[in-house]
Interface confidence: low
């Protein structure tokens, strides 16, 4: 642990001014793992003037950074690039004359305290005023800056010509497209200072390319993948003062696929587990030995987890007997197509022939996802019913 600091497994604390620190604290290679540090508190360190680009990067788990009553004058633009967990930054009473939005724009900060710094009045710090105004909290900070006459003026009163927030405008508010197709999005931006424009496509899987001039831009997405359904695409306008974005949600329609269908497992019920993907939501239909399976309260489809366009569930059977052994087929369909898969189920041997469960179907407990969703599928045809399963438990209560 650096001199003048205290270190624990999760905190670094440097508050005693003598002898003090001249550089941002770094841990010795064989000491505490810097990834586990969640809080760094620095106070009264008048000789600490700079946070360099690589000073903080090792502390990837850092949530709270406090540097108060110290000599901080300069923070490198990419200083916090690797610190995506940062939530609270307190730079009270330092020597900062300017501070850029770029330090913090990728962070989801819930607190940025900058009181008591000798900021210079310019468009460079207008973003701080904008940030203050956007806060609904009543305890806004008393921030000041020095104007050309070296007068301290409240940041709240700062007026700088041609220094305002930009705007972004995206043509399509909702976007639904079929898998495999291509689309082009257009966006226009405006503002003074003239903003930069960029596209934020997150983790878009589909191939995309953009053409951007200063105030106009287009994004072409080709051969759209079903994996991109539900993703958000944003057009961002950014200048010194701040940013504006206009976003569109991408909905991709695609034919169903049954990605998982397994032999039955026994928990409190027997379950034939499945996973189906599709958008719009596929209708599900079960067949038993080639005939439509009419569901009842004893044999029914349960969806446990819905993950956007993916459905995890079970064909649930209460106390099945040898009469329920056989082939089970799941069909999933929507307007873009259908998919089917089949498994063989063996619940119990025939009486007198095979007393135990077939060893080919061991009792592996299927993880119940815990939240029952509405069943999907239509089961109106009541012909070819398969034998009902036992409907009471040992207490005589119905299941």
């Amino acid at each position: 642990c650096p001199t003048s600091c205290k270190c624990s497994a999760s905190r670094i604390w440097c508050s005693d001014p003598s002898p003090g620190i001249v550089a941002f604290p770094r841990l010795e290679p064989n000491s505490v793992d810097p990834e586990n540090i969640t809080e760094i508190f620095i106070a009264n360190q008048k000789r600490l003037e700079i946070i360099n680009e690589d000073d903080v990067e090792a502390y990837v788990g850092l949530r709270n950074l406090t540097i108060v009553d110290s000599g901080l004058k300069f923070v490198a633009h990419k200083a916090f690039l690797k610190n995506s967990n940062l939530q609270h930054i307190n730079f009270t009473r330092n020597k900062l004359t300017s501070l850029s939005r770029k330090h913090f724009r990728h962070l989801d900060l819930s607190e940025l305290i900058l009181v008591g710094n000798p900021f210079t009045c310019s468009c460079d710090i207008m973003w701080i005023k904008t940030l203050q105004e956007a806060k609904s909290s009543p305890d806004t900070q008393d921030l000041y800056c020095l104007n050309e006459s070296s007068k301290n003026i409240p940041l709240a009163n700062l007026q700088i010509p041609n220094c305002g927030l930009p705007s972004a405008n995206l043509a399509a508010p909702n976007l639904t497209v079929e898998e495999g197709k291509s689309i082009t999005l257009s966006c226009s931006v405006a503002g003074d200072p003239v903003p930069n424009m960029y596209w934020d496509v997150g983790n878009l899987v589909s191939k995309h390319m953009n053409e951007t001039s200063h105030t106009q831009g287009s994004l072409r997405i080709t051969n759209i993948s079903s994996d991109d359904s539900g993703k958000q695409i944003s057009c961002v306008a950014e200048n010194l003062v701040g940013e504006d974005q206009d976003s569109v949600n991408l909905t991709v329609h695609f034919a169903p696929t049954i990605t998982f269908l397994e032999s039955p497992t026994s928990d409190h019920h027997w379950c034939i587990p499945f996973t189906v993907k599709g958008n719009p939501k596929p209708a599900l239909q079960w067949f038993y030995n080639g005939a439509i399976l009419n569901e009842s309260k004893y044999i029914c489809t349960k969806i446990h987890v819905t993950n956007h366009t993916e459905y995890h569930g079970c064909l649930q059977l209460d106390n099945p007997t040898h009469m329920n052994n056989g082939d089970y087929t799941l069909i999933a369909k929507n307007e873009y197509g259908k998919d089917e898969k089949q498994i063989s189920a063996h619940f119990m041997g025939w009486p007198g022939i095979d007393d135990g469960a077939n060893p080919n179907y061991p009792d592996v407990i299927y993880e119940d996802y815990g939240t029952a969703a509405n069943d999907i599928g239509d089961t109106t045809n009541r012909s070819n019913e398969i034998p009902s399963t036992d409907v009471t438990d040992k207490t005589g209560r119905e299941h």
Partner: antibody, heavy 114, light 110 residues
Framework: EVQLVQSGAEVKKPGESLKISCKGS????????IGWVRQMPGKGLEWMGI????????RYSPSFQGQVTISADKSISTAYLQWSSLKASDTAMYYC???????WGQGTLVTVSS | QPVLTQPPSASGTPGQRVTISCSGS????????VNWYQQFPGTAPKLLMY???QRPSGVPDRFSGSKSGTSASLAISGLQSEDEADYYC???????????FGGGTQLTVL
């Protein structure tokens, strides 16, 4: 050798002004806080205030705010404690010390008596 | 009224272990390290313990420091007659933006 050397004992009358000094040597004077501590006869140590000579950032203990002035001249590595109008109750031993407290001055005895 | 609270006096016989407490708040001891000073009559205080439990060179290991929450303690084991002195705790205080002292504890070796 790191040391703080204070000016000599003073005998003053009530209402007079006084400025006592504390000269640092053997270390970077501008980079460490220097504080002034009062010890009245038979009493404990009391922090009066502290100054950072590098930028003259000065903080006073609430009970001494407005009663004394702490200053520093970094060009000669010296900190000062000053009264504009002394009172009999200012009679005490005054120590300067660098925070971290590994360095203390030898003390300056101030006696205020009519 | 000192910001940090110490008992005004403590005593012990030679060879005994004596503990002096120092109680503060979250703005001082709760968040900062504690220093302890020893002062003999007519002399300037001397640093006895820094960073709560670190001894400067020359201070015997009979002296030890500890902290729990907003309280700190100085323990002297194997008490000797030359330990008879005044002991003060101090810490930086965030509310006052400077250091604060305890009122001091007069240790008597019986």
């Amino acid at each position: 050798e790191v040391q703080l050397v204070q000016s000599g004992a003073e005998v003053k009358k009530p209402g007079e002004s006084l400025k006592i000094s504390c000269k640092g040597s053997g270390y970077s004077f501008t980079s460490y806080w220097i504080g002034w501590v009062r010890q009245m006869p038979g009493k404990g140590l009391e922090w009066m205030g502290i100054i950072y000579p590098g930028d003259s950032d000065t903080r006073y203990s609430p009970s001494f705010q407005g009663q004394v002035t702490i200053s520093a001249d970094k060009s000669i590595s010296t900190a000062y404690l000053q009264w504009s109008s002394l009172k009999a109750s200012d009679t005490a031993m005054y120590y300067c010390a660098s925070w971290g407290m590994d360095v203390w001055g030898q003390g300056t005895l101030v006696t205020v008596s009519s | 009224q000192p910001v940090l609270t110490q008992p005004p006096s403590a005593s012990g016989t030679p060879g005994q272990r004596v503990t002096i407490s120092c109680s503060g708040s979250s703005s001082n001891i709760g968040t900062h390290t504690v220093n302890w000073y020893q002062q003999f009559p007519g002399t300037a205080p001397k640093l006895l313990m820094y960073s709560t439990f670190q001894r400067p060179s020359g201070v015997p290991d009979r002296f030890s420091g500890s902290k729990s929450g907003t309280s700190a303690s100085l323990a002297i084991s194997g008490l000797q007659s030359e330990d008879e002195a005044d002991y003060y705790c101090a810490a930086w205080d965030d509310s006052l933006n400077g250091p604060v002292f305890g009122g001091g504890t007069q240790l008597t070796v019986l």
